[in-house]
Amino acid sequence: YKLVCYYTSWSQYREGDGSCFPDALDRFLCTHIIYSFANISNDHIDTWEWNDVTLYGMLNTLKNRNPNLKTLLSVGGWNFGSQRFSKIASNTQSRRTFIKSVPPFLRTHGFDGLDLAWLYPGRRDKQHFTTLIKEMKAEFIKEAQPGKKQLLLSAALSAGKVTIDSSYDIAKISQHLDFISIMTYDFHGAWRGTTGHHSPLFRGQEDASPDRFSNTDYAVGYMLRLGAPASKLVMGIPTFGRSFTLASSETGVGAPISGPGIPGRFTKEAGTLAYYEICDFLRGATVHRILGQQVPYATKGNQWVGYDDQESVKSKVQYLKDRQLAGAMVWALDLDDFQGSFCGQDLRFPLTNAIKDALAAT
C-alpha cells in the first residue's frame, strides 16, 4: 500500500516546538512525501518561498538512506487561487510553457514527480484540467525517453460531491494520473452553524449535515462509480481537527455554535488544531466517540473539536483495504506529533505510524 504524506513548507514558520523542517521527517515512515506548495510565475513552475530550494534539498536527502522513498512537489494550493490556474490551463501557450518548465525543475531539485493541487477547477475548467493532466503526462513520458525513470504525476482532488461533479472528469483524468489523493476531510465547517465531524468515515445516524454526501465512505464510493480505479485511489486521513465554539450548554453532534474554535498555540488558525495541539487540549477534556461515524470528538468548556485518533485511523485503513484502494494519504506530517513530545507516547508521528502499522497488518 501507498502511504502518501504531505509536508507543508509554512510549518517552518510556526513558533518553538511547532516549527517543522524536512530534516525532522522520518525517512522510513511514508512511501511518498509531497512538498506543499510550489508556485507558478510567468507560466513557469517556481518556488513559493525564498528558502524553498534549501528545504527541497533537506527533504530529498531523506532518500539517501531510503532509496525507496519517492518525493513529489505539489503545485498550487489555497493561496495560489483557482483563477491563476484557470488562466494557465485554458491558454494553449501558457499551458505548454508551464508543462515544459516542470521536468527540469523537478529533476534539478531531486523530486520524483509532480502533484497538482488545483483547488478547485470551476465548471468551465473541467476540460482544461483534463487537458493539463493529459499533456503533462505526455511530457513526462517524452522526457523519460533517454532511459530516465519517468516522473510521477498525481492530483489532490476534493471529496465534495458538488465539486467532484463540476470540476473533474474522473474517468479521463484517472487514465493519466499515477495516483489520486482524495481529500476526505473538511466535510463539515463553521459555515454549517452546528458542531459536526469534518472527516467521518460513514454518515452515521448522528450526522447533522443536510446531505448524505459529507463522509469518506460516500466520497470514495462516488469516485469509484465515476471510474476512478481503486488501484489509483489514495484516501485522505487528516492529522488535524476542526474546532468550534459552542453557543449553548449543548455539546453533542449538531449542537449550535457561535463560530470556529479558538486558534491553537502553534498553528494560530481559528477552527483548526494540529493533532499535537489536540493532545494538549485532551488534558481535562471529555472525549466521545461518534459510533456510526467511527471518529472521536472532545469538548472542554465552550470548545468542541472533531479529530482523528489512533483508533479512528485504524478503522479508516481497514475500510480502504476492504475497498482495495491504493493506500492512504496524510495531511500533514507537520500537524502530527512530529517531535513525539505532546501526545505522551514517546513516539514521533503517532497518527501516521498508526496508519503505517494498519496498512502493514494482514
Partner: antibody, heavy 115, light 107 residues
Framework: EVQLVESGGGLVQPGGSLRLSCAAS????????MSWVRQAPGKGLEWVSS????????HYADSVKGRFTISRDNSKNTLYLQMNSLRAEDTAVYYC????????WGQGTLVTVSS | DIQMTQSPSSLSASVGDRVTITCRAS??????LNWYQQKPGKAPKLLIY???TLQSGVPSRFSGSGSGTDFTLTISSLQPEDFATYYC?????????FGQGTKVEIK
Amino acid sequence: EVQLVESGGGLVQPGGSLRLSCAASGFTFSSYAMSWVRQAPGKGLEWVSSISSSSGTTHYADSVKGRFTISRDNSKNTLYLQMNSLRAEDTAVYYCAKGGAFDYWGQGTLVTVSS
Amino acid sequence: DIQMTQSPSSLSASVGDRVTITCRASQDISRWLNWYQQKPGKAPKLLIYAASTLQSGVPSRFSGSGSGTDFTLTISSLQPEDFATYYCQQSYSFPLTFGQGTKVEIK
C-alpha cells in the same frame, strides 16, 4: 562543475550607468533564484538584489532601489544587474551568487564610481 | 530590517584550537542562518546553511548550531587554511542581511 563568471565592471563617473553580467554554467540555471552581493573595499558583505527562477519576483536593498534593476535570460544562462545613477558609495566588488543560501559565488567584478 | 551582530569582530588563535563565533539576530529567524568563509581577494564560500547543515565538501571540523536569535559557528580544531574572515547571514526575510564579519588571525 558550477561556474559563475561576472563581467561588465569598470570605472564610471557619478551619475553614470553600467550593466553587469553573470554567465552561469554547470547547473540548471532556470531552476534557481540568483542574487547580487557587493563588497566595498576593506568592508563587509552587502546584499544588493535577488530574482526568482522564473523572474516573477525581484527584491532590492533600500540603498539601490529605483536605481538598479536585476534581470535574467534563462535561454542564455545569464544574470544581469543594470546600474543607473551610480554614486561613489556604490564602489565595490560585485558578486553574483546562486540559490537561496548562496552556495556558489562568482569571482567578482570591480565597479569604481569616481570623477 | 533584521540586524545581524557577530562577536567577536576579530580573534587570535593557534592551529589546533577550538574556535567559536557567535551571531545574534535582532528578531527570531527560526533556523535561517548561513555561515560563509572569505579569504583575502577571494569570493566567499558557503560553510553552513539552515543554522546547522554542513555544505557539501566542507570539512566536518566546522559545525553550526542555534535557532531563533542566537547562533554559533564552531571550528573544532583550527587548521592553517581556516585563517580567514567569517560572516553570518540571515535568509529568513528580505532584505537579506550579513553580520559585520569575524576575522580569525594567527596568534
